[in-house]
């Protein structure tokens, strides 16, 4: 259900957590790549 139709507050919380975790992983990967390239 990646379209995020659900409005249940627990589902909303889990979606927020998932996005946070994903962004942290992506940003962390980019940071590591930048350090490596230096």
């Amino acid at each position: 259900h990646s379209d995020g139709i659900f409005t249940d507050s627990y589902s909303r919380y889990r979606k927020q957590m998932a996005v946070k975790k994903y962004l942290a992983a992506v940003l962390g990967k980019r940071y590591k790549q930048r350090v490596k390239n230096k």
Epitope: H1, Y10, S11
Partner: antibody, heavy 120, light 110 residues
Amino acid sequence: SVEESGGRLVTPGTPLTLTCTVSGFSLSSYDMSWVRQAPGKGLEYIGIINTNDDTWYASWVKGRFTISKTSSTTVDLKMTSLTTEDTATYFCARISDAYVFDYAYYFTLWGQGTLVTVSS
Amino acid sequence: ALVMTQTPSSVSAAVGGTVTINCLASQNIYNSLAWYQQKPGQPPKLLIYRASTLASGVSSRFKGSGSGTQFTLTISGVECADAATYYCQQGAGADNIGNPFGGGTEVVVK
């Protein structure tokens, strides 16, 4: 692992607190849930506590039960106004991780359960 | 309210046969469904999540299918060890809901 404790025989109206003790993972990383099962019956969801200590409950709970974290490794289920209908095995279960394309919740790791008997 | 209805409540199967269990959601839950196996005196064990993904260590004889409101658990090549009660569970909502679990299906192996 997940282990429940505190189940015993109580009389109607007596409050009771069950404890779920986890090991091998952190409560700061996983949401936890309580589920119960009356003798010979199906599974019944009670509620969930997340890593931020926010809680969600089944509609039937109506404030009688409260889930809280009491330490970095324990989750309590406080039960009040108990009736014979609350006689059940109470399970503590770890909730699945959330992912961007799958943020549904599932019960991935269960304890053996603790039996609560409410009888006069 | 979102209600999960499981059928049949009990089913009998011969060793080597196939068992089909159905789960109906009262509203669209996309693929947010899990299946659990519970043997007497034991806690439930997660078999399948995201409607069709096998949990770690689960035999490929178990197959989950469906999406939206209709879901199926199929057990092929039934073994004596498959005798248990099976539950479906919607994973779409947990706030002020009735029960995310279906009523259960008892599988008896002959």
